[in-house]
C-alpha cells in the first residue's frame, strides 16, 4: 500500500445567492468552511475503493463534493451517477494537489444517490464513493422549551420535545444595570437540563437543533421593581405548564411571600419557595406558582403578596389554541423619494410568531419587538424606495396572518418611446400615474404646439415588478403625420417629460428626450 495516494474528501455547503442553476465549478455563491468526509478505504472490495461519510443535504441546498489527491504526476477522472458518465476536470491547488469537484446546485430528489468518482493516476487507479441523500426535515421539529419541577428537589428541568434531540441550555443574567444581551459579560450559559440556581434576575431556557433555536423565559414578578404601567399578561394554551416566579429582596429574613389566584390562596402542591442570603447579607426569597397542565379555569389574576413589599399581579389567560390578532386590511402609502418610511404591523400573538416580509418574490428577515401593552411590533424599512406590493406574513403553531401593503413613490415621469411602421408608443412609470399629450412638430409649429387628439390610445398596465404600474400611450400612424416629428409628453403633479419621435419608415427611430420640470 506504499504507492496509494493520500486523498481527502470534503463537503462544501453553499449559501444560495439567487445563483443560476447548473453544474459549474466557478461557484456563484458564498461558501461555508469545508467539512471533512474522512474518506476511508473500503475493506473487502475488489480494487481500491474509498468511501466518504454519508452526506445529508437539505432540499434546494447547494453543495460541492470535493476530492483532494496528493499523488505525483497528472491524474484523469470520471464521475458516474446513476449509470451516466459526467465530465470531470481536475485541476491543481497551490499545494500541487489534484482537486476534483462535483457541484450540486439546488438539491432535488433526482440528484440524491451514489456518486462514483474514478481516478487514474500515473501510479494507480482507484474509486471514491459518495452517498448523497436528502435530509428528511419533514420529520424534524423544534418545540419551545417548557419547565418542570424536579422530583424531590428545588430545581427546574427544561424540556423541549424536538427531533432531532436538541441541545438544551440555560441562559442566566444577573445584571441590574448591565445589558442582558447574549454576548454580554453578565450572561452565563449552562448546557444542562436541570437548573438549581433559581435566584437570578433573568432566567431563560433555550433548545437548539438543525431547525434553529427556541427559548422560553421564566415569567418573573419582582416585588422590588416598580410595577409596569400595564399589567403583565401571560398567555398559555390548554394543557401547557404554567410557571410564574415571584422574587423579593429584603434587609432580613422577616418577611414571607404568598400566591393568590383571584383572591384565593393557591392550593398546596401548586407552589414552592426557596430562599438564600445575597452577598450583602440581604435575604432573597422566591416563590414559584406552577400548574403542570393548565385548564380554562386557571385563567385569572395571579397576585404575589409580601409582608414587606407592595403586592403585584399578572393576568394569566388560557386559550384553546394559539392566535395572531392584528388588522389585516391592506394599506397603501405614497411617499417622496427622500422620505424615510417603514411598514409596520402591531399584533398580539401566542405562541410567538415566525414572520417574513416579502417584496417581488424575495423574502426579508423579520424583526419583532414586544411592547409594554402586550402588543408586538414588526417594522420593515429596507424597501430602498422601490414601489410595489409588500407582504407581511406571520405564523405560529396554530394561526397564520397575512397583510398587504402598497408603496407608491411620488416622482416625475420618465418617458421611453418606441415606434413601428404603424404606430408610436410611449411608456412612463412616474407616480401619480401620468396623463399624456401628443404634439406634432411642423413648419407651422416648430415648437411642437399642435396637439394630436386623433388615434391616441392610453392604458395602464402592470409592470414586471409586482404591484408597480406603468402607463403607456400609443399613437396610430396616419398619412397626416407620417414623416413628421411628433412629441409625446407625460405629466403629473411633479413635472413633465417628453420624447420626440420621427415618424418615417420602420426601423430604428431617433428619439430625443426632453425633460420639462
Amino acid at each position: 500500500n506504499q504507492d496509494l495516494p493520500v486523498i481527502k474528501c470534503v463537503l462544501i455547503n453553499h449559501k444560495n445567492n439567487d445563483s443560476s442553476v447548473g453544474k459549474s465549478s466557478s461557484y456563484p455563491m458564498v461558501s461555508e468552511s469545508p467539512e471533512d468526509l474522512g474518506c476511508a478505504l473500503r475493506p473487502q472490495s475488489s480494487g481500491t475503493v474509498y468511501e466518504a461519510a454519508a452526506v445529508e443535504v437539505d432540499v434546494s441546498a447547494s453543495i460541492t463534493l470535493q476530492v483532494l489527491v496528493d499523488a505525483p504526476g497528472n491524474i484523469s477522472c470520471l464521475w458516474v451517477f446513476k449509470h451516466s458518465s459526467l465530465n470531470c476536470q481536475p485541476h491543481f491547488d497551490l499545494q500541487n494537489r489534484g482537486v476534483v469537484s462535483m457541484v450540486i446546485l439546488k438539491m432535488t430528489e433526482t440528484q440524491a444517490g451514489e456518486y462514483l468518482l474514478f481516478i487514474q493516476s500515473e501510479a494507480t487507479n482507484y474509486t471514491i464513493l459518495f452517498t448523497v441523500s436528502i435530509r428528511n426535515t419533514l420529520l424534524y421539529t423544534l418545540r419551545r422549551p417548557y419547565f418542570r419541577k424536579m422530583e424531590n428537589q428545588d430545581a427546574l428541568v427544561c424540556i423541549s420535545e424536538s427531533v432531532p434531540e436538541p441541545i438544551v441550555e440555560w441562559v442566566l443574567c444577573d445584571s441590574q444595570g448591565e445589558s442582558c444581551k447574549e454576548e454580554s459579560p453578565a450572561v452565563v450559559k449552562k448546557e444542562e437540563k436541570v437548573l438549581h440556581e433559581l435566584f437570578g434576575t433573568d432566567i431563560r431556557c433555550c433548545a437548539r437543533n438543525e431547525l434553529g433555536r427556541e427559548c422560553t423565559r421564566l415569567f418573573t414578578i419582582d416585588l422590588n421593581q416598580t410595577p409596569q404601567t400595564t399589567l403583565p399578561q401571560l398567555f398559555l394554551k390548554v394543557g401547557e405548564p404554567l410557571w410564574i416566579r415571584c422574587k423579593a429582596v429584603h434587609v432580613n429574613h422577616g418577611f414571607g411571600l404568598t400566591w393568590e389566584l383571584e383572591n384565593k390562596a393557591l392550593e398546596e402542591g401548586n407552589y414552592f419557595e426557596m430562599s438564600t442570603y445575597s452577598t450583602n447579607r440581604t435575604m432573597i426569597r422566591i416563590l414559584f406558582a406552577f400548574v403542570s397542565s393548565v385548564a380554562r379555569n386557571d385563567t385569572g389574576y395571579y397576585t404575589c403578596s409580601s409582608s414587606k413589599h407592595p403586592s403585584q399581579s399578572a393576568l394569566v389567560t388560557i386559550v384553546e389554541k394559539g392566535f395572531i390578532n392584528a388588522t389585516n386590511s391592506s394599506e397603501d402609502y405614497e411617499i417622496d423619494q427622500y422620505e424615510e418610511f417603514c411598514f409596520s404591523v402591531r399584533f398580539k400573538a401566542y405562541p410567538q410568531i415566525r414572520c417574513t416580509w416579502t417584496f417581488s418574490r424575495k423574502s426579508f428577515p423579520c424583526e419583532q419587538k414586544g411592547l409594554d401593552n402586550g402588543y408586538s411590533i414588526s417594522k420593515f424599512c429596507n424597501h430602498k424606495h422601490q414601489p410595489g406590493e409588500y407582504i407581511f406574513h406571520a405564523e405560529n403553531d396554530d394561526a397564520q396572518f397575512t397583510k398587504m401593503f402598497t408603496l407608491n413613490i411620488r416622482r416625475k415621469p420618465q418617458v421611453l418611446a418606441e415606434a413601428s411602421a404603424s404606430q408610436a408608443s410611449c411608456f412612463s412609470d412616474g407616480y401619480p400615474l401620468p396623463s399624456w399629450t401628443w404634439k406634432k412638430c411642423s413648419d407651422k409649429s416648430p415648437n411642437c404646439t399642435e396637439e394630436i387628439t386623433e388615434g391616441v390610445w392610453n392604458r395602464k398596465a402592470n409592470r414586471k415588478v409586482f404591484g408597480q404600474w406603468v402607463s403607456s400611450s400609443t399613437l396610430n400612424m396616419s398619412e397626416a403625420i407620417k414623416g413628421f416629428l411628433v412629441k409625446c409628453c407625460a405629466y403629473n403633479s411633479l413635472g413633465t417629460s417628453c420624447e420626440t419621435i420621427l415618424l418615417n419608415s420602420p426601423g430604428p427611430f431617433p428619439f430625443i428626450q426632453d425633460n420639462i420640470s
Epitope: T229, D336, E339, C342, K369, Y375
Partner: antibody, heavy 124, light 110 residues
C-alpha cells in the same frame, strides 16, 4: 430645505392663554406626525403633545392634559398648540419637532427635525 | 408611567470612548425603541441615534447605540471636543401613549 419655524411665544400671566404656531416647509407635511417638546430654563427636555399626520390622533403629557390642545392645518402646513390656564411651571422654550419616519407608528423613529424654539414665559 | 434614568454627567479625554446609559424605572427598556439626542447650549436637540442603534445620515459613525435587557447605551468612540453637549434618551411608552425623555447627561470632554 426641511424647516420648522415656531412663533407665538411671549410673556403671559398665570391663568392666561397663548397659541403657538409652527410653520413647516420643505416636506410633505401631512405625511408626518408632529410633536411639541418644551425645555424649562436650565432643565431637561419634556414632551408636551403629539398629533398624527391627518390630525386624527392626538396625545398629551399628563401635566398639560385638559389645558393644552394640539392641532394642525395641513393645507397651510402649520402645527398649533393652544395653551390655556397657563401656570408658572409652563415657562419654557417650546420646540416643534417632526417624526423621523413618514406615516410612522409612534413606537419607533423619534424626531429628526426641530425648530429653533419659541420662548413662553408665564409670570405675574 | 415609568421614568428613564441617565447619569447626571460623564467626562472623558479626547480620543477615548465614552458610554451613557439609560435605564427604565420599571419593566425592560428592551421593549422600547430608544432614541438619543444631542443638545448643545442655546441650540435645538439633534437626533443622533434612533430605533436603538440606527444613525441618521450626517451623524458620524463614532456614535452608536445598543439596547437590551435593563439598559440602553449610547457609545461615542474617539470623543472630540465638539461632542461636548447634553445627551437625552427617549422612548415611546406604549401603555400610556406618551413620549418619555431621560433626565439628560452632560458630557464634558476634558
Amino acid at each position: 430645505e426641511v424647516q420648522l419655524l415656531e412663533s407665538g411665544g411671549g410673556l403671559v400671566q398665570p391663568g392666561g392663554s397663548l397659541r403657538l404656531s409652527c410653520a413647516a416647509s420643505g416636506f410633505t407635511f401631512s405625511s408626518y406626525a408632529m410633536s411639541w417638546v418644551r425645555q424649562a430654563p436650565g432643565k431637561g427636555l419634556e414632551w408636551v403633545s403629539a398629533i398624527g399626520g391627518s390630525g386624527g390622533s392626538t396625545y398629551y403629557a399628563d401635566s398639560v392634559k385638559g389645558r393644552f390642545t394640539i392641532s394642525r392645518d395641513n393645507s397651510k402646513n402649520t402645527l398649533y398648540l393652544q395653551m390655556n390656564s397657563l401656570r408658572a411651571e409652563d415657562t419654557a422654550m417650546y420646540y416643534c419637532a417632526r417624526d423621523y419616519y413618514a406615516f410612522s407608528d409612534p413606537a419607533y423613529g423619534g424626531m429628526d427635525v426641530w425648530g429653533q424654539g419659541t420662548l413662553v414665559t408665564v409670570s405675574s | 408611567n415609568f421614568m428613564l434614568t441617565q447619569p447626571h454627567s460623564v467626562s472623558e479625554s479626547p480620543g477615548k470612548t465614552v458610554t451613557i446609559s439609560c435605564t427604565r424605572s420599571s419593566g425592560s427598556i428592551a421593549s422600547n425603541y430608544v432614541q438619543w439626542y444631542q443638545q448643545k447650549p442655546g441650540q435645538a436637540p439633534v437626533l443622533v441615534v434612533y430605533d436603538d442603534s440606527d444613525r441618521p445620515s450626517g451623524i458620524p459613525e463614532r456614535f452608536s447605540g445598543s439596547n437590551s435587557g435593563n439598559t440602553a447605551t449610547l457609545t461615542i468612540s474617539r470623543v472630540e471636543a465638539g461632542d461636548e453637549a447634553d445627551y437625552y434618551c427617549q422612548v415611546w411608552d406604549s401603555s400610556s401613549d406618551h413620549w418619555v425623555f431621560g433626565g439628560g447627561t452632560k458630557l464634558t470632554v476634558l
